[in-house]
């Protein structure tokens, strides 16, 4: 009778096994051990027992121990099992971003790993199981559909293969993929809410802003703002689950036309835009030209107002005739022309919206002096001892010096609050002189005595 | 990490009796083959005894056959070698080791056995 | 008398290679029986220092290298050092004893 000892064993892949073999007769003919697997004798005494070193075991085997005794020859056989863990364990790859709502598909691979009868392969979000199942075919694959939530966001789901080896007295082996982070995101059908100027003007700014709502995670959104090939800049504030993004735009001449206002959306795999079309005009301000700004009272004056060729003036109110880029007026310059001014308006139609433009100029008109009777009275009566302030406004442009003097020496305290006394009394010469020339004007100071009683 | 340490060594009489454990750490002691080794004052080293990890087989050198008995108990983790009608040509240091199937690959510190009138 | 032959001594000095000799017969090395080595130094236990004829188990430095051929081994010592100083044995199987051999031992001084 031939035995074997261990009758079962299992293993780790390229492990080494003592088996052996043992015979119920004293003195066997024959006793050995048959297997393809690598073996070593141990060097022990005694004829019915000898011990073999099997190594290098890659993969189950049946070694068969024999015994040639004088009853007769028999067999027996032991079984080795390998065990190994799984050689990969891999999520097929997705993309990380996932939209909120869609079906997600997790599909595990597993290559290698025995004994298959104890390896199992579980699906996890975390640390909940969501799937488990035997690894069956090479690969084994396993799959598990996953309806993607907002809460999600951020979790990681992973592979897991156990090889359960703990009903043969050894432990629980595990072997885990790399961890696939999901993130979710909800981006709303809607597009992005673009306020700006439909219109802009060469060499100025303008504003421009983009918002969204009902969007997750908010702080993950791109925003992407651009007027035709130039990127603008944003500032982007957040909300709860929105975000609106400002940023200013300059244009140049070059920019002239009709530009492509852009403002996308980034989120996840997914994107929302919103085009809008911005006119950039050139209109500088129309041109007032005075023939002279400053004339002689009595000079003719021609007053012209030139626009944008596409722009409509009025000067001083008064439409261009025709109706047109271009108007003018003449005039006699008269003293009450000084400081008259004269104002053109351009109208520009851009993009069905009304631009206006103005510009003023002022005409100075010279003229006098004048000295009259309203401002400058020829005759005043005043009681001796009384306060009284002499006035006399002489008028011209420019401005004239004025000086009133008695005898040519004594000077009449114009604008200026006196005493009257007997002294004041007398007649004065005034003269009003400025560049434009000078007048005179005789003013007689007459002092009231009082009555004695 | 293996260790193993032997003791009952002594002075005996001519004709009497000792019994030496190893008791035996830091491996699986009921896998392991186990003798017993000696060596006399200034000499070589002798095999003595050697017994099978369950104990079910033992073997002796010639000079102690019948006199000496090796044992096991395996559930203390401990060797013993029980001599008997000892001589003086037994006084010697005893060994007691692991063998691995080829050679003696780890050795306790050894006990001394004097046997003399 | 060891059925395993030594040399009962042999010395060397510091830096220098020794070679100790174990001659046996064709029941035991001669038979296919793998030769071991063992050292022991003064007062303690034998240590394992080469088996299988030329293997070192962990821990041994590799000027320690072993050889066997046809009836006889050799264990070579190279860049002694004084704290080699101590007894090697060589150490058989013999089929015809059913026993385990080992040789007379071999003092070695630096």
């Known amino acids: 009778q031939t035995s074997v000892s261990p009758s079962k064993v299992i293993l780790p892949r390229g492990g080494s096994v003592l088996v052996t073999c043992s015979t119920s007769c004293d003195q066997p003919k024959l006793l050995g051990i048959e297997t393809p697997l690598p073996k070593k004798e141990l060097l022990l005494p005694g004829n019915n027992r000898k011990v073999y070193e099997l190594s290098n075991v890659q993969e189950d085997s049946q070694p068969m121990c024999y015994s040639n005794c004088p009853d007769g020859q028999s067999t027996a056989k032991t079984f080795l099992t390998v065990y190994w863990t799984p050689e990969r364990v891999e999520l097929a790859p997705l993309p990380s971003w996932q939209p909120v709502g869609k079906n997600l598909t997790l599909r595990c691979q597993v290559e290698g790993g025995a004994p298959r009868a104890n390896l199992t392969v579980v699906l996890l979000r975390g640390e909940k199981e969501l799937k488990r199942e035997p690894a069956v075919g090479e690969p084994a694959e396993v799959t598990t559909t996953v309806l993607v939530r907002r809460d999600h966001h951020g979790a990681n789901f992973s592979c897991r293969t156990e090889l359960d080896l703990r009903p043969q007295g050894l432990e629980l082996f595990e072997n885990t993929s790399a961890p696939y982070q999901l993130q979710t995101f909800v981006l709303p059908a809607t597009p992005p809410q673009l306020v700006s100027p439909r219109v802009l003007e060469v060499d100025t700014q303008g504003t421009v802003v983009c918002s969204l709502d009902g969007l997750f995670p908010v702080s993950e959104a791109q925003v992407h703002l651009a007027l035709g090939d130039q990127r603008l800049n944003p500032t982007v504030t957040y909300g709860n689950d929105s975000f609106s993004a400002k940023a200013s735009v300059s244009v140049t001449a070059e920019d002239e036309g009709t530009q492509r206002l852009t403002c996308a959306v980034i989120l996840g795999n997914q994107s929302q835009e919103t085009l809008q079309t911005v006119t950039i005009y050139s209109f500088p301000a129309p041109n007032v030209i005075l023939t002279k700004p400053e004339v002689s009272e009595g000079t003719e004056v021609t007053v012209k107002c030139e626009a944008h060729p596409r722009a409509k003036v009025t000067l001083n109110g008064v439409p261009a005739q025709p109706l047109g880029p271009r108007a003018q007026l003449l005039l006699k310059a008269t003293p009450e022309d000084n400081g008259r001014s004269f104002s053109c308006s351009a109208t520009l139609e851009v993009a069905g919206q009304l631009i206006h433009k103005n510009q003023t100029r002022e005409l100075r008109v010279l003229y006098g002096p004048r000295l009259d009777e309203r401002d400058c009275p020829g005759n005043w009566t005043w009681p001796e001892n009384s306060q009284q302030t002499p006035m006399c406004q002489a008028w011209g442009n420019p401005l004239p010096e004025l000086k009133c003097l008695k005898d040519g020496t004594f000077p009449l305290p114009i604008g200026e609050s006196v005493t009257v006394t007997r002294d004041l009394e007398g007649t004065y010469l005034c003269r009003a002189r400025s560049t434009q020339g000078e007048v005179t004007r005789k003013v007689t100071v007459n002092v009231l005595s009082p009555r004695y009683e | 990490e293996v260790q193993l340490l032997e003791s009952g060594g002594g002075l005996v009489q001519p004709g009497g009796s000792l019994r030496l454990s190893c008791a035996a750490s830091?491996?699986?002691?009921?896998?392991?083959?186990m003798s017993w080794v000696r060596q006399a004052p200034g000499k070589g080293l002798e095999w003595v005894a050697f017994?099978?990890?369950?104990?079910?087989?033992?073997y002796y050198a010639d000079s102690v056959k019948g006199r000496f008995t090796i044992s096991r108990d395996n559930s203390k983790n401990t060797l013993y070698l029980q001599m008997n009608s000892l001589r003086a040509e037994d006084t010697a240091v005893y060994y007691c080791?692991?063998?691995?199937?080829?050679?003696?690959?780890?050795w306790g510190q050894g006990t001394l056995v004097t046997v003399s009138s | 008398q060891s059925v395993l032959t030594q040399p009962p001594s042999a010395s060397g000095t510091p830096g220098q290679r020794v070679t100790i000799s174990c001659t046996g017969s064709?029941?035991?090395?001669?038979?296919?029986?793998?030769v071991h080595w063992y050292q022991q130094l003064p007062g303690t236990a034998p240590k394992l220092l080469i088996y299988?004829?030329?293997n070192r188990p962990s821990g041994v430095p590799d000027r320690f290298s072993g050889s066997k051929s046809g009836t006889s081994a050799s264990l070579a010592i190279s860049g002694l050092r004084s704290e080699d100083e101590a007894d090697y044995y060589c150490?058989?199987?013999?089929?015809?004893?059913?026993?385990?051999?080992f040789g007379g031992g071999t003092k070695l001084t630096v």
């Open positions: 080791a692991r063998y691995s199937g080829w050679y003696f690959d780890y």
């Open positions: 830091g491996f699986t002691f009921s896998n392991a083959w």
């Open positions: 017994i099978w990890y369950d104990g079910s087989n033992k």
């Open positions: 064709s029941s035991n090395i001669g038979a296919g029986y793998d």
């Open positions: 299988d004829n030329n």
């Open positions: 150490q058989s199987y013999d089929s015809s004893l059913s026993a385990w051999l």
